[in-house]
């Protein structure tokens, strides 16, 4: 009689995570009598996966009925495979005894697990940045196997090239993670822009996973200010408007100053949205010129999104307007309707930055 051989016909088996793995093993003889055991790994630290003789192995089932006469097929199925199950599995024949002793091992079957990467998570900078600045975005995806993976960055569908990617760990592992950092230059038109991280892996069958970040969470577009004097409503009243244009996000507070003294503060509420996602807002001030003997310096001061204030001033010439008798108080009002620019031009075109 020829000596028993343990045949593991598959050198390697690849299984998708969550599926079952079938590991084939046959013996060539009924002799010697004794059980089959399956191990992961070799040597003293090997892990018992299945023991025909005894033990409870809830994930393992025998492919054939091992109690049936002349059975020589000791293939097993392992259910619900995870990346942690990867390794080399050995089918080992034992010889009956007290205790049973190892008789012969198969050559082993390497089980590799194909695990899908997790949905990429894209995160941007902690603080907002303004156009022309470069900001970094990170993309992370975990738990995939095998190690080979492709990551691409896009901004509004255009592929980016300025990024660095690492796959960890460098050595062998049951599963891997990818981390990538991309640099993006912001423009004033980026409120509606998206940054996309795209991950392609063998497990995804050509349908890559995408993670997105909206640049609206990252960008800050500072407003431009224009202060104009509108046509006179009444002989002693002047309407001055402050146009706040192209700002994002909406959080904005406006303060009117008359000769450096706070006249009124208000918060942007009824704004209009531009096509590019930025906002416009207008505030106006009715000034009773009869209450002023000298020229009035009107300043529109805007604090946008917690940043240092930006201001624009307009010099109101009192001499140009006759004073109305019997009135010595300044009448003020506000409005939020956008109006056309006045024929009057600003005397001061400069932005005044007040640092807090």
């Amino acid at each position: 009689e020829e000596e028993l051989q343990v045949i593991q016909p598959d050198k390697s088996v690849s299984v998708a995570a969550g599926e079952s793995a079938i590991l084939h093993c046959t013996v060539t003889s009924l002799i010697p009598v004794g059980p089959i055991q399956w191990f992961r790994g070799a040597g003293p630290a090997r892990e018992l996966i299945y023991n025909q003789k005894e033990g409870h192995f809830p994930r393992v089932t025998t492919v054939s009925e091992s109690t049936k006469r002349e059975n020589m097929d000791f293939s097993i199925s392992i259910s619900n495979i995870t990346p942690a199950d990867a390794g080399t599995y050995y089918c080992v024949k034992f010889r009956k005894g007290s205790p049973d002793t190892e008789f012969k091992s198969g050559a082993g079957t390497e089980l590799s697990v194909r695990a899908k990467p997790s949905a990429p998570v894209v995160s941007g900078p902690a603080a907002r940045a303004t156009p022309q600045h470069t900001v970094s975005f990170t993309c992370e995806s975990h738990g995939f196997s095998p190690r080979d993976i492709t990551l691409k960055w896009f901004k509004n569908g255009n592929e980016l090239s300025d990024f660095q990617t690492n796959v960890d760990p460098v050595g062998e592992s049951v599963s891997y993670s990818i981390h990538s950092t991309a640099k993006v230059v912001l423009t004033r038109e980026d409120v509606h822009s998206q940054v996309i991280c795209e991950v392609a892996h063998v497990t995804l069958q050509g349908d890559p996973l995408r993670g997105t970040a909206n640049l609206s969470e990252t960008i800050r577009v500072p407003p431009t200010l224009e202060v104009t004097q509108q046509p006179v409503r009444a002989e002693n009243q002047v309407n001055v408007t402050c146009q706040v244009r192209k700002f994002y996000p909406q959080r904005l507070q406006l303060t009117w100053l008359e000769n450096g003294n706070v006249s009124r503060t208000e918060t942007a509420s009824t704004v209009t949205e531009n096509k590019d996602g930025t906002y416009n807002w207008m505030s106006w001030l009715l000034v009773n010129v009869s209450a002023h003997r000298d020229d009035v310096k009107l300043t529109c001061q805007v604090e946008h999104d917690g940043q240092p204030a930006v201001s624009k001033s307009h010099d109101l010439k009192v001499s140009a307007h006759p004073k109305e008798q019997g009135s010595n108080t300044a009448a003020e009002n506000t409005g939020s309707n956008e109006r056309g620019s006045s024929d009057y031009k600003d005397d001061d075109d400069k932005h005044h930055h007040h640092h807090h």
Partner: antibody, heavy 119, light 110 residues
């Protein structure tokens, strides 16, 4: 190690039934056949039947087919052999034995249960 | 059914001498290249103990003075040098079909 522990001796009257138990330990009960064999005093071995605890497949010696019933309780790893319509010539030691190689052989034996049938 | 006939029914052999027990099947017990014959030893008051499986393979823990041979219908159990502890009744069993036992051979010391 493999152990098969059988129930105690029984004395029965002719026409009665007996149910002998065999509790297995030291191995996975559902992975190996259990055989039942009897031996009358001073006589040889006589095979009664066998059962596969994994699916309750049974094979009976034609002589015992109508009177013997094998069952198992996998929750307690116990095999049972019931013999009905007892006669005096059923007096014997009844053994359970485990087939370790699926060769329909008897590798490990219980110590036996003496069943005495007497009026 | 396959009938197994053992010979002799009883045997007396001197210590250290060879003992030979025969088992003949009423038809072949061979299948798939294996001979489905098993030999058991039973001492008084004890259950039988498996000695030889598939005609010629020594079970674990069995002294190598025991051996089995034969094929088809004729099989032999041999004890090469009889020891006092070998006094027992020996049975052959087949499993080519449903199992049956031979009638047994009683081995004594001469």
């Amino acid at each position: 190690q493999v152990q098969l522990v059988q129930s105690g001796a029984e004395v029965k009257k002719p026409g009665a039934s007996v149910k002998v138990s065999c509790k297995a330990s030291g191995y996975t009960f559902t992975n190996y056949w259990i055989n039942w064999v009897r031996q009358a005093p001073g006589q040889g071995l006589e095979w009664i039947a066998m059962i596969d605890p994994s699916d309750s497949e049974t094979h009976y010696n034609q002589i015992f087919k109508d009177r013997a019933t094998l069952t198992t309780d996998t929750s307690t790893s116990t095999a049972y052999m019931e013999l009905r319509s007892l006669r005096s010539d059923d007096t014997a030691v009844y053994y359970c034995a485990m087939d370790y190689g699926s060769l329909y052989a008897m590798d490990y034996w219980g110590r036996g249960t003496l069943v005495t049938v007497s009026s | 059914d396959i009938v197994l006939t053992q010979s002799p029914d009883s045997l007396a052999v001197s210590l250290g001498e060879r003992a030979t027990i025969n088992c003949r099947a009423s038809k072949s017990v061979s299948s798939s290249g294996y001979n489905y014959i098993f030999w058991y030893q039973q001492k008084p008051g004890q259950p039988p103990k498996l000695l030889i499986y598939l005609a010629s393979n020594l079970d674990s823990g069995v002294p190598d003075r025991f051996s089995g041979s034969g094929s088809g219908t004729d099989f032999t159990l041999t004890i090469s040098s009889l020891q006092a502890e070998d006094v027992a009744v020996y049975y052959c069993q087949h499993s080519r079909e449903l199992p049956t036992f031979g009638q047994g051979t009683k081995l004594e010391i001469k």
